[in-house]
């Protein structure tokens, strides 16, 4: 004979637990029905009657199967430095996350309580560790042979360009300037007209390793004044 299915409320067998989507009510000492997400317990169960559930009111929610007497209040509206990534509904709380260029300085159960702007590394410093949703940018001084000339929360230290002959040596906040050694090539409109380096550098997107392996321009200075290369014009 198949076992009889118990309907809530029912007294559990000693040592057993209630079934899925049921809970044991301490007062009634019975297994009773839970309320589904988006609802709450309007009337608790007794020995003879099951839980009566009701929908959550506006701006309140329950995300779990539950037997709470009142739904939870949704969090306050997102602040100006935040973006609402999940709206308040009867089944879920509002979630606010930090907008681009900001990180979460104080998190809460879900989303962020307090956003702060990402640190900007000043010239001479580059990004050692990029900012994340929950951590600020870490800056580091540009190692010898590298530079950063921007105030930025994303720019890393980049290697100085390598010159045959250096006009102005680079430092932590400025690239090296090369003395032109060949006829100046035409450049794209709007491009910065600098003497042509021996090798062009690609735009790096990762922080340079510490210590930097980029060559230092201090070794590239000529020993004395040198005449301009044939066919070039002095700038």
């Amino acid at each position: 004979l198949p076992a009889q299915v118990a309907f809530t409320p029912y007294a559990p067998e000693p040592g057993s637990t209630c079934r899925l989507r049921e809970y044991y009510d301490q007062t009634a000492q019975m297994c009773c029905s839970k309320c589904s997400p988006g609802q709450h317990a309007k009337v608790f169960c007794t020995k003879t009657s099951d839980t009566v559930c009701d929908s959550c009111e506006d701006s309140t929610y329950t995300q779990l199967w539950n037997w709470v007497p009142e739904c939870l209040s949704c969090g306050s509206r997102c602040s100006s430095d935040q973006v609402e990534t999940q709206a308040c509904t009867r089944e879920q709380n509002r979630i606010c996350t930090c907008r681009p260029g900001w990180y979460c300085a104080l998190s809460k159960q879900e989303g962020c309580r307090l956003c702060a702007p990402l640190r900007k590394c000043r010239p001479g410093f580059g990004v050692a560790r990029p900012g994340t949703e929950t951590s600020d940018v870490v800056c580091k001084p540009c190692a010898p042979g590298t530079f950063s000339n921007t105030t930025s929360s994303t720019d890393i230290c980049r290697p100085h360009q390598i010159c045959n002959v250096v006009a102005i040596p680079g430092n932590a906040s400025m690239d090296a300037v090369c003395t032109s050694t060949s006829p100046t090539r035409s450049m794209a409109p709007g491009a910065v007209h600098l003497p042509q380096p021996v090798s062009t550098r690609s735009q790096h997107t990762q922080p340079t390793p510490e210590p930097s392996t980029a060559p230092s321009t201090s070794f590239l200075l000529p020993m004395g004044p040198s005449p301009p290369a044939e066919g070039s014009t002095g700038d």
Epitope: T17, C32, T62, Q63, L64, Q109
Partner: nanobody, 123 residues
Framework: EVQLVESGGGLVQPGGSLRLSCAAS????????VAWFRQAPGKEREEVSC????????NYADSVKGRFTISRDNSKNTLYLQMNSLRAEDTAVYYC????????????????WGQGTLVTVSS
């Protein structure tokens, strides 16, 4: 729904210490009030300690006050019970259980139960 697994039980001498863990999966533990219960052979299951959903309130049975400490680590989705100055009468199977959004202790009702972990205090 949340599933719970208790661990950390064992044999300990009177006056000794143990730390029980209750690891949750299937849901975030910080949505729940969580309680430790124990059941000694031939006795009723009793609530030993409870921590509310917000973590703002804890409660202890008189028999363990000053000796046991309940805590939770939401980042690890785990509940703990630090048990010091253990006595022979603390011997029992220890269970954790939950109440969604539970705002007061003791719990008004119980949700899921773990399988329990046995604590034996004996010399």
């Amino acid at each position: 729904e949340v599933q719970l697994v208790e661990s950390g039980g064992g044999l300990v001498q009177p006056g000794g210490s143990l730390r029980l863990s209750c690891a949750a999966s299937g849901s975030r533990l910080d949505y729940y009030a969580v309680a430790w219960f124990r059941q000694a052979p031939g006795k009723e299951r009793e609530e030993v300690s409870c921590i509310t959903y917000s973590g703002g309130s804890t409660n202890y049975a008189d028999s363990v006050k000053g000796r046991f400490t309940i805590s939770r680590d939401n980042s690890k989705n785990t509940l703990y019970l630090q048990m010091n100055s253990l006595r022979a009468e603390d011997t029992a199977v220890y269970y954790c259980t939950t109440e969604p959004y539970g705002s007061s202790c003791p719990l008004s009702g119980y949700d899921t139960w773990g399988q329990g972990t046995l604590v034996t205090v004996s010399s």
